[in-house]
């Protein structure tokens, strides 16, 4: 019997408090042998693949999710699956991307840097909105 | 609407070998697994493979490695499997089918079928 | 390879019976992460390709009459119909949709008296 999915995480760099116009990287990380990382935003209702996955460990590989210019419409909730054939994995837990305005002042920092509590997250739910296949600002990094 | 297309009958020689068509129409066909069955009366129904369009990964059963090869040709929307080594035991009705749990998570199974091609091979 | 077992092999009912028909794999279909049965049942009409009836083990598809019901988890499910009709008379098989290679039940034939 093979194992069940390991869930899958998410993180973003460099931070998850974004000024606007910068740019922001969500990391989307499950077992060897996926196929397809889908970067989830607001639930299902809006969605990007990529099929260019790369070996993060000899245990791990990840997939990156680039949004170059950070707009006030791409705050919100993100969250990560898999598709390891022939099955897709549990989402992720979810993470809240936040979008501030560039403040400049030498006392704060233009992002939020990961901290050892990681980003922050909500439990994924459990509903199943209809999807649309769009990716509305969502493009692959690609890393080669 | 949503077909899968299919020659209907193939006749080949022994030792040959065959390549059957399925011409995806009306869905977005790098979206969704396409698959391959095979039916005859004293097997039943039996899964060969599953080529996913965008990537050209394939996925085969054991027993049909080295027999059946699956590619797909995203420009024409069509999926191909081509049978070498040709025996009298291959003569079967070969199905592909649109797997949709790719698109979509919360569904699993075909969900569209193609006619069905009749291979016959005889000398 | 998951093993799919059907039973009976055959029934012969009348039209408006209820009639239900068994599945067992031989290792579980439900995938813990998300709860999904990956458990697929088919319906096949004489010269006609299978059609999709149910799939998640108890979702209708699509256009798919509510007399035709799927339950189950994990190794052992069943279809019911509820009532059966004249057009219903087919062979019905179950799928593993868990894991590769994907397999089938040898299927059940429903023949109306």
């Known amino acids: 019997q093979e194992e069940d999915l390991p869930r899958p995480s998410i993180s973003a760099e460099p931070g998850t408090v974004i000024p606007l116009g910068s740019h922001v990287t969500f990391v989307c990380r499950g077992p060897v042998g996926v196929q397809t990382f889908r970067l989830e935003r607001d639930s299902r209702s809006t969605y990007n693949d990529t099929e260019d996955v790369s070996q993060a460990s000899p245990s791990e590989s990840e997939a990156r999710f680039r949004i170059d210019s950070v707009r006030e419409g791409n705050a919100g909730l993100y969250r990560c699956i898999y598709y390891k054939p022939p099955k897709w994995s549990e989402q992720s837990d979810y993470l809240e991307l936040l979008v501030k305005e560039s403040s400049g002042g030498p006392d704060s920092p233009d992002t939020e840097p990961g901290s050892s509590a990681g980003p922050t997250q909500r439990p994924s739910d459990n509903s199943h909105n209809e999807h649309a296949p769009a990716s509305q600002g969502l493009k692959a990094e690609h890393l080669y | 609407q949503i077909q899968l297309q299919q020659s209907g009958a193939e006749l080949a020689r022994p030792g040959a070998s065959v390549k059957l068509p399925c011409k995806a129409s009306?869905?977005?066909?790098?979206?969704?697994?396409l698959n391959w069955v095979r039916q005859t009366t004293g097997q039943g129904l039996e899964w060969i493979g599953e080529i996913y369009p965008r990537s050209g990964h394939t996925y085969y059963n054991e027993k049909f490695k080295g027999k059946a090869t699956l590619t797909a040709d995203k420009s024409s929307s069509t999926a191909y499997m081509e049978l070498r080594s040709l025996t009298s035991e291959d003569s079967a009705v070969y199905f592909c089918?649109?797997?949709?749990?790719?698109?979509?998570?919360?569904?699993?199974?075909?969900?569209?079928w193609g006619q069905g091609t009749t291979l016959t091979v005889s000398s | 390879d998951i093993v799919m077992k059907q039973s009976p092999s055959s029934l012969r009912v009348s039209a408006g019976e209820k009639v239900t028909m068994s599945c067992k794999s031989s290792?579980?279909?439900?995938?813990?992460?998300?709860?999904?049965?990956?458990l697929a049942w088919y319906q096949q009409k004489p010269g006609q390709p299978p059609k999709l009836l149910i799939y998640g083990a108890s979702t209708r598809e699509s256009g798919v009459p509510d007399r035709f019901t799927g339950s189950g988890s994990g190794t052992d499910f069943a279809l019911t119909i509820s009532s059966v009709q004249a057009e219903d008379l087919a062979v019905y098989y179950c799928q593993n949709d868990h894991s590769y290679p994907f397999t089938f039940g040898s299927g059940t034939k429903l023949e109306i008296k």
């Open positions: 009306d869905y977005i066909f790098i979206s969704y697994g």
């Open positions: 089918a649109r797997r949709s749990v790719f698109y979509d998570y919360d569904k699993n199974g075909f969900d569209y």
């Open positions: 290792q579980s279909l439900l995938n813990s992460g998300n709860q999904k049965n990956y």
